[in-house]
Interface confidence: medium
């Protein structure tokens, strides 16, 4: 007897991550073999949407025309093929943007930091939140979450970063967001250029926790000090 | 010139409901956010809560059960209702505004002359 | 909640003299402290925003300082008019709170 059939791939064009009132394109791949695709998104009621497969027939579109707060979420596809149904597709997680206001990204004591010196990138939003995002340009694991205890409502979040490296140079940007629903996002603050000056040999930081082997120096995640910021904000990698 | 004026009852029974207006002008409460601030005779001021007409109110946790805030834009009023007064809850109430509309520093920049409440038993 | 404590509770200066105001977070706020002079029967008055920013029209004897959980408030040559009680806010997580206030008196 053939084993389970293999999974469908799920993506989403252009990205995961969408601002308000754009469009998006959710894709789900299987096998030719595909007679008809399914989505699903998490907490609605299953199927979310049902689509015919694209000739040929190894694939299936499902459009959102314009973002909005209603399609921000978890979703999984699924196919079916005359043996029956696939199992469930690796989870997409699709993120609006656009939610709330922008915060306000500053370094301090500059954004220009010599090497070995210390630097914190300080994120405040105009209203109290519970989650906190640092992206940092062209990374591949680029979020670092500082996320209240007990959802405690606070105005800034601090990611301090010492040593500083020249890998830790780069453009930053901060998102805020309520942890009732982490799929919803501010607008991204205004970019923030963090300029490393000194030896170009310094010592890379190592990380506080692994990352993929295949990420090179610009895809290592950001190496804030400590393990619980002083805020009262704790850590979470993504 | 920003201008914020508090009116209300000077004198109010325990366990009834204070209702306090601040009255804006200079400015529009579409762009800014206006707090509320108590403070007693003798002591430190204390924040009640806020209103902001596109991020919506935050309130003090400790009274929130007996605070509610609310605007009228077209009237550039923000009104503050406690309920359930007790006589600790004397004191001067002021209204406030931040400083800029980017609103991520100087929120008590400008203040009303203030508007002294005496809850009796 | 956050608390801020002040100290000192009470100090007496001279006319000219250089005074330091210290204000404390029971956690950190980043820079999101405000100081306030308040005189006798009068509003309270922002003096300084985001931990170091002077507000309109405040005399630049007035400096603020610190980020984290220690703050300061120094005035460079206190003048009479700079009697009064001064007051710390933090407004870095709810509910924002102020300090109890250090009272500046004239010697």
């Known amino acids: 007897q053939a084993g389970p059939l293999p999974k469908p791939t799920l993506w989403a064009e252009p990205g995961s991550v969408i601002s308000w009132g754009n469009s998006v394109t959710i894709w789900c791949q299987g096998t030719l073999e595909a007679r008809e695709y399914r989505l699903d998104k998490e907490e609605s009621p299953a199927p979310w949407d049902r689509q015919n497969p694209l000739e040929p027939k190894n694939k299936a579109r499902f459009s959102i025309p314009s973002m909005t707060e209603d399609y921000a979420g978890r979703y999984r596809c699924y196919y079916r093929s005359p043996v029956g149904w696939s199992q469930p597709s690796d989870p997409l997680e699709l993120v609006m943007t656009g939610a709330y206001s922008k915060p306000t990204l500053s370094a301090l004591p500059s954004p220009l930091v010599t090497s070995g010196k210390s630097v914190t990138l300080l994120c405040q939003s105009r209203s109290p939140m519970d989650t906190f995002l640092l992206i940092k340009e062209r990374a591949a694991h680029p979020l670092l979450h500082l996320r209240s205890e007990h959802g405690a409502q606070q105005h800034q979040a601090e990611f301090p970063m010492s040593p500083v490296t020249s890998v830790h140079g780069g453009t930053y940007r901060c998102f805020s967001s309520h942890g009732f629903s982490h799929y919803l996002l501010s607008h991204p603050s205004d970019p923030l250029e963090l300029i490393v000056s000194g030896s170009l040999e310094d010592p890379r930081p190592s990380p506080t926790r692994s990352v993929s082997t295949a990420a090179g120096p610009e895809d290592q995640p950001l190496m804030p000090t400590g393990s619980v910021p002083h805020s009262g904000l704790r850590r979470h990698w993504e | 010139q920003v201008q914020l004026k508090e009116s209300g009852p000077g004198l109010v029974q325990a366990s009834e409901t204070l209702s306090l207006t601040c009255t804006v002008s200079g400015f529009s409460l579409t762009s800014y956010c206006v707090n509320w601030v108590r403070q007693p005779s003798g002591k430190g001021p204390e924040w009640l809560g806020r209103?902001?007409?596109?991020?919506?109110?935050v309130y003090n946790l400790t009274l929130e059960s007996r605070l509610s805030i609310s605007g009228d834009t077209s009237k550039n009023q923000v009104f503050l209702k406690m309920n359930r007064l007790r006589t600790d809850d004397t004191g001067t109430y002021y209204c406030?505004?931040?400083?800029?509309?980017?609103?991520?520093?100087?929120?008590?920049?400008?203040w009303g002359q203030g508007t002294l409440v005496t809850v009796s038993s | 909640e956050t608390v801020m404590t002040q100290s000192p509770t009470s100090l007496s200066a001279s006319i000219g003299e250089r005074v330091t105001l210290n204000c404390k977070a029971s956690?950190?706020?980043?820079?999101?402290v405000d100081w306030y002079q308040q005189t006798p029967g009068q509003s309270p008055k922002l003096l300084i925003y985001?931990?170091?920013n002077r507000h309109t029209g405040v005399p630049d004897r007035f400096t603020g300082s610190g980020f984290g959980s220690g703050f300061t408030l120094t005035i460079s040559n206190v003048e009479p008019e700079d009697l009064g009680v001064y007051y710390c806010?933090?407004?870095?997580?709810?509910?924002?709170?102020f300090g109890p206030g250090t009272k500046l008196e004239l010697k």
């Open positions: 406030t505004r931040d400083r800029d509309t980017l609103g991520i520093t100087g929120w008590f920049a400008y």
């Open positions: 956690q950190s706020v980043g820079i999101n």
């Open positions: 806010l933090q407004y870095g997580s709810v509910p924002y709170t």
């Open positions: 209103f902001w007409y596109d991020e919506g109110k």
């Open positions: 985001g931990s170091a």
